[in-house]
C-alpha cells in the first residue's frame, strides 16, 4: 500500500470487470487499477467481491473481509484471460445474487458497485444491463461505472446511479491510474467519529456524525442515522442536516448508564447500512454538569 488517501467505511464493495475480447491487451492495466483501489479500502468491516463478465458472469471471489482471501482473489484476477462478448448484465446479476443472499437474514450491509467496461453496449445488451443494474439498486446498491476508450457515456449514466456516478477515462487504459483518487473520494462513505461520544443517561442530545460521502446518496432525504443499542435494538433517526462530511442527528434517549450505541448510517431509508466502529456511550451526569 502506498499510503495516501484511504477509506475507512464498512460496506460491501463489488468490482464488476469487463473481460471481453476487446480488453485482451489491457488486462494488466485493469488488474493494477483494481489492485491499487482495493488496497485503499481498509476498514476491517469492509467486504469485497471480484466479478468478471464476458459472455457470462463469473464470481472470482465471493464477498469476504478476510485480507488473505482478498490477496488470493487478486491473484486469481491477475490470471484472467479475456475473451468473449460484453454481457455486462451477467456481471450485475452475479452482484445482485450476492447482495440478496448475504443480506437476506435481517441486517443489510450497504453495497457499492464499481463496474468497468470499455465498449458500447448494443441495443439488447444495454437494455439487459440497465435492467440488472436497476435490480442491484432495488437491493440497495449504489452503482458507479468506469468507462474506458470506446464507451457510451449516456448509456453508462443510465446504468450507474447518475451522470455523476460515471468516471470517463478517455485517454485509454493507461489513464485508469489517474482516476483512482476521484473514485475513492466518490465511492467512499465512512463514519469517522461522533461528537459527543459520551452522552448523559436519560437526556436528549444531538450528535454530530463526522465522516465522508454522506451526500453520495441518490436522494439525501433518504439518509438516516442509525443507533444499534447494546448489540440488539436498532433505532433510526432522520438527520436535521446532511452535509458531505457530517450529519447532525438526534440521538436516542438512552435511559441507563453504561449503555452503548454503535453508529451506522443508511443512504436509502434503512434498506441497508454502512457500519463503523464508532460507539456512543452513556454516563451519569449530575444536575448542573
Amino acid at each position: 500500500e502506498d499510503g495516501g488517501p484511504a477509506c475507512y467505511g464498512g460496506f460491501d464493495l463489488y468490482f464488476i470487470l469487463d473481460k471481453s475480447g476487446s480488453v485482451l491487451h489491457h488486462w494488466n492495466e485493469i488488474y493494477y487499477f483494481v489492485e491499487q483501489l482495493a488496497h485503499k479500502f481498509i476498514s476491517p468491516q469492509l467486504r469485497m467481491s471480484f466479478i468478471v463478465f464476458s459472455t457470462r458472469g463469473t464470481t472470482l471471489m465471493k464477498l469476504t473481509e478476510d485480507r488473505e482471501q482478498i490477496r488470493q482473489g487478486l491473484e486469481e484476477l491477475q490470471k484472467v484471460l479475456p475473451g468473449g462478448d460484453t454481457y455486462m448484465h451477467e456481471g450485475f446479476e452475479r452482484a445482485s445474487e450476492q447482495i440478496y443472499y448475504e443480506n437476506r437474514q435481517g441486517y443489510r450491509t450497504a453495497s457499492v458497485i464499481i463496474a468497468l467496461t470499455d465498449g458500447e453496449l448494443h441495443e439488447d445488451l444495454f437494455f439487459y444491463s440497465e435492467r440488472e443494474a436497476n435490480r442491484s439498486r432495488d437491493l440497495g446498491a449504489i452503482v458507479y461505472c468506469v468507462g474506458v476508450k470506446d464507451f457510451n457515456e449516456t448509456q453508462l449514466a443510465r446504468i450507474a446511479d447518475s451522470k455523476d456516478h460515471v468516471f470517463p477515462v478517455n485517454d485509454g487504459f493507461q489513464a485508469l491510474q489517474g482516476i483512482i483518487h476521484s473514485i475513492l473520494k466518490k465511492s467512499c462513505i465512512e463514519i469517522l467519529a461522533a461528537e459527543p461520544s459520551t452522552i448523559c443517561a436519560g437526556e436528549s442530545f444531538q450528535v454530530v456524525v463526522r465522516g465522508n460521502g454522506f451526500r453520495h446518496a441518490r436522494n439525501v432525504d433518504r439518509v438516516l442515522c442509525s443507533f444499534k443499542i447494546n448489540d440488539s435494538v436498532t433505532l433510526n433517526e432522520k438527520p436535521f442536516s446532511v452535509e458531505d462530511t457530517y450529519l447532525l442527528c438526534p440521538a436516542p434517549i438512552l435511559k441507563e448508564v453504561g449503555m452503548k450505541a454503535a453508529l451506522q448510517v443508511s443512504m436509502n431509508d434503512g434498506l441497508s447500512f454502512i457500519s463503523s466502529s464508532v460507539i456512543i456511550t452513556t454516563t451519569h451526569c449530575s444536575d448542573g454538569s
Epitope: 457470462r56 464470481t59 445482485s96 445474487e97 440478496y100 443472499y101 437476506r104 435492467r131 432495488d138
Partner: antibody, heavy 121, light 106 residues
Framework: QVQLQQSGPGLVKPSQTLSLTCAIS??????????WGWIRQSPGRGLEWLGR?????????DYAVSVKSRITINPDTSKNQFSLQLNSVTPEDTAVYYC???????????WGQGTLVTVSS | DIELTQPPSVSVAPGQTARISCSGD??????AHWYQQKPGQAPVLVIY???KRPSGIPERFSGSNSGNTATLTISGTQAEDEADYYC?????????FGGGTKLTVL
C-alpha cells in the same frame, strides 16, 4: 402465510397446448422483490426450470433455452395469479409441473402442490 | 452452463452425520442451494446461498461450498430426514439442478 395453489388439466393431447395457473395468496404477483416461476419434474429429466416473470415497474420474463420457442408465462394482476402455456407438447413434456415463488429472483423458497400433466392421445 | 452431479444414494444410521455432495466445475464461484423432497410432496428449500438456513429449518442442516464441491451436512440425522435431496445453482439466466440423492436413514 403465503400459499400457491395450482390448477389445470392433467391430460393434454400431443401437439396441443398445456395450460396451468398458479393462484397466489398472502403475497402479490407484482411485488417488487420477487419473481414467479415454473419448474417441472420427470423421471427421465429430473427437476427442470422452465421460466420466470417479475415486475420492476414493468413486466419481464426469462425462459429456459430448452423451451424458449414454445413457452409463455403471463401475470394476471386482477386475479393475483400467473399462468404457464407450453405449445406443441409431446410425450416428452409429461411431468409434474410446479409453480414457485422466487424471492430476489434467485431461488425457489415456496412451491405449489404440483400438477401431474400427462401428454397422451 | 454448469452441470451438477450428485451421488444417487447415501445411507446413514440415526443420530449420525450424513453428507451429500454436489460437484460441478468451479462450483465455489456459484451459490449452491439444497432442496428436500419427500414422496408425493413438493420440494422444500433447506439451505440457500451455500450455507444459509431458511427460518423453520432445523439447525442440524448446514451447507458449505468450496473448490468443485458443495456439501449438504445433516448432523444427528433423524428418521424424518429420509428424502430425496437436490442441489441447485443459478447460472446465466438458467437454474440448474443436480440429479438428486436419495438419503436412507437405516
Amino acid at each position: 402465510q403465503v400459499q400457491l395453489q395450482q390448477s389445470g388439466p392433467g391430460l393434454v393431447k400431443p401437439s396441443q397446448t398445456l395450460s396451468l395457473t398458479c393462484a397466489i395468496s398472502g403475497d402479490s404477483v407484482s411485488t417488487n422483490g420477487a419473481a414467479w416461476g415454473w419448474i417441472r419434474q420427470s423421471p427421465g429429466r429430473g427437476l427442470e426450470w422452465l421460466g420466470r416473470i417479475y415486475y420492476r415497474s414493468k413486466w419481464y420474463n426469462d425462459y429456459a433455452v430448452s423451451v424458449k420457442s414454445r413457452i409463455t408465462i403471463n401475470p394476471d394482476t386482477s386475479k393475483n395469479q400467473f399462468s404457464l402455456q407450453l405449445n406443441s407438447v409431446t410425450p416428452e413434456d409429461t411431468a409434474v409441473y410446479y409453480c414457485a415463488r422466487m424471492p430476489g429472483g434467485f431461488l425457489f423458497d415456496l412451491w405449489g402442490q404440483g400438477t401431474l400433466v400427462t401428454v397422451s392421445s | 452452463d454448469i452441470e451438477l452431479t450428485q451421488p444417487p444414494s447415501v445411507s446413514v444410521a440415526p443420530g449420525q452425520t450424513a453428507r451429500i455432495s454436489c460437484s460441478g466445475d468451479n462450483i465455489r464461484s456459484y451459490y449452491a442451494h439444497w432442496y428436500q423432497q419427500k414422496p408425493g410432496q413438493a420440494p422444500v428449500l433447506v439451505i440457500y446461498g451455500d450455507s444459509k438456513r431458511p427460518s423453520g429449518i432445523p439447525e442440524r442442516f448446514s451447507g458449505s461450498n468450496s473448490g468443485n464441491t458443495a456439501t449438504l451436512t445433516i448432523s444427528g440425522t433423524q428418521a424424518e430426514d429420509e428424502a430425496d435431496y437436490y442441489c441447485s445453482s443459478y447460472a446465466s439466466h438458467d437454474y440448474v439442478f443436480g440429479g438428486g440423492t436419495k438419503l436412507t436413514v437405516l
